[in-house]
């Protein structure tokens, strides 16, 4: 009998209101044994996958998706989903990213699609572990 997969959670560091040109990291969390985390933007057709999964805690694994320099176009709704063989989970709740004008900040540079996605380092040693890739579904349209 297949196990029921818990819904993933999503959060953002340092928060969900980000000044233009600053960085943000989306954190997706799920159970032990996740192969792939996917960060979806607005709809299921736009997403980024990573198989670089960390051991977040005794009962959880996580992946981190970083946008190095937030643009106005990055504002919107984000959610996570994960693949734990042999199936995909339900989606997390949506998280809304708001981008605000930074007073006197530098202009936001243009970035290539997908060029700035990625998790940042966690200080805890047992978060350093990685995960094997799953077979991927749809062709990704990069989020960033």
């Amino acid at each position: 009998q297949e196990e029921d997969l818990p819904r993933p959670s999503i959060s953002a560091e340092p928060g969900t209101v980000i000044p233009l040109g600053s960085h943000v990291t989306f954190v997706c969390r799920g159970p032990v044994g996740v192969q792939t985390f996917r960060l979806e933007r607005d709809s299921r057709s736009t997403y980024n996958d990573t198989e670089d999964v960390s051991q977040a805690s005794p009962s959880e694994s996580e992946a981190r998706f970083r946008i190095d320099s937030v643009r106005e176009g990055n504002a919107g709704l984000y959610r996570c989903i994960y693949y734990k063989p042999p199936k995909w989970s339900e989606q997390s709740d949506y998280l809304e990213l708001l981008v605000k004008e930074s007073s006197g900040g530098p202009d936001s540079p243009d970035t290539e699609p997908g060029s700035s996605a990625g998790p940042t380092q966690r200080p805890s040693d047992n978060s350093h572990n990685e995960h094997a890739p799953a077979s991927q579904g749809l062709k990704a349209e990069h989020l960033y």
Epitope: D52, Q55, N126
Partner: antibody, heavy 119, light 107 residues
Framework: EVQLVESGGGLVQPGGSLKLSCAAS????????MYWVRQAPGKGLEWVAR??????????YYAASVKGRFTISRDDSKNTLYLQMNSLKTEDTAVYYC??????????WGQGTLVTVSS | DIQMTQSPSSLSASLGDRVTITCKAS??????LAWYQQKPGKAPRLLIS???SLETGVPSRFSGSGSGTDYTFTISSLQPEDIATYYC?????????FGGGTRLEIK
């Protein structure tokens, strides 16, 4: 089909250097963590180094036995993993495997390349 | 570093036998345990991850169990092609560490 093909092994004198390469194909290289694992002749397995994906800022980690002497790197545009080995010691003699990782476990292995450190 | 103590280091069994290998971690590894099979002159092959999850294509006669610090690998009915060396490995924390291996032979 996942393929990992190591090259660059050979005979080197103690104190010498060698650079191993691993050509990867059949999977999305740039979203995977990659590892080197070695096995001395007739001995068990030892994790050597790992490099995370760009999404983890290409963070690197090393076994204490090689830290400061070995450097793991990757070129995502070439789907290639590297291991630069400096100040080699006789105890570094081993078959070196390039491995596509899981979250710390080792899902797919290359055929290995033999490094012999001897005078 | 987490030490992995695997036993026995070698064992001899008959075809059809049930074979059990144990691996004990020096601290809790929260089921972050993998098992590998290695045949002479070949690279290791991942059989099991997360203590119990059988990899795709691995025969169902192989199984894993355990939690905390104590883990077990079982072959329910030994086949000729199972003759190999088996390793456990923890991936809860770096440095990732392997057990010393168990060499399995036919009696």
């Amino acid at each position: 089909e996942v393929q990992l093909v190591e090259s660059g092994g050979g005979l080197v004198q103690p104190g010498g250097s060698l650079k191993l390469s691993c050509a990867a194909s059949g999977f999305t290289f740039n979203t995977n963590a990659m590892y080197w694992v070695r096995q001395a002749p007739g001995k068990g397995l030892e994790w050597v180094a790992r490099i995370r994906s760009k999404s983890s800022n290409y963070a690197t980690y090393y076994a204490a036995s090689v830290k400061g002497r070995f450097t793991i790197s990757r070129d995502d545009s070439k789907n290639t993993l590297y291991l630069q080995m400096n100040s080699l010691k006789t105890e570094d003699t081993a078959v070196y495997y390039c491995v596509r990782g899981g979250s710390g476990f080792f899902a797919y292995w290359g055929q290995g390349t033999l490094v012999t450190v001897s005078s | 570093d987490i030490q992995m103590t695997q036993s026995p280091s070698s064992l001899s069994a008959s075809l059809g036998d049930r074979v059990t290998i144990t691996c004990k971690a020096s601290e809790d590894i929260y089921i972050r345990l993998a098992w590998y099979q290695q045949k002479p002159g070949k690279a290791p092959r991942l059989l099991i991850s997360t203590a119990t999850s059988l990899e795709t294509g691995v025969p169902s006669r192989f199984s894993g169990s355990g939690s905390g610090t104590d883990y077990t690998f079982t072959i329910s009915s030994l086949q000729p092609e199972d003759i190999a060396t088996y390793y456990c490995q923890q991936y809860w924390s770096t440095p990732y560490t392997f057990g010393g291996g168990t060499r399995l032979e036919i009696k």
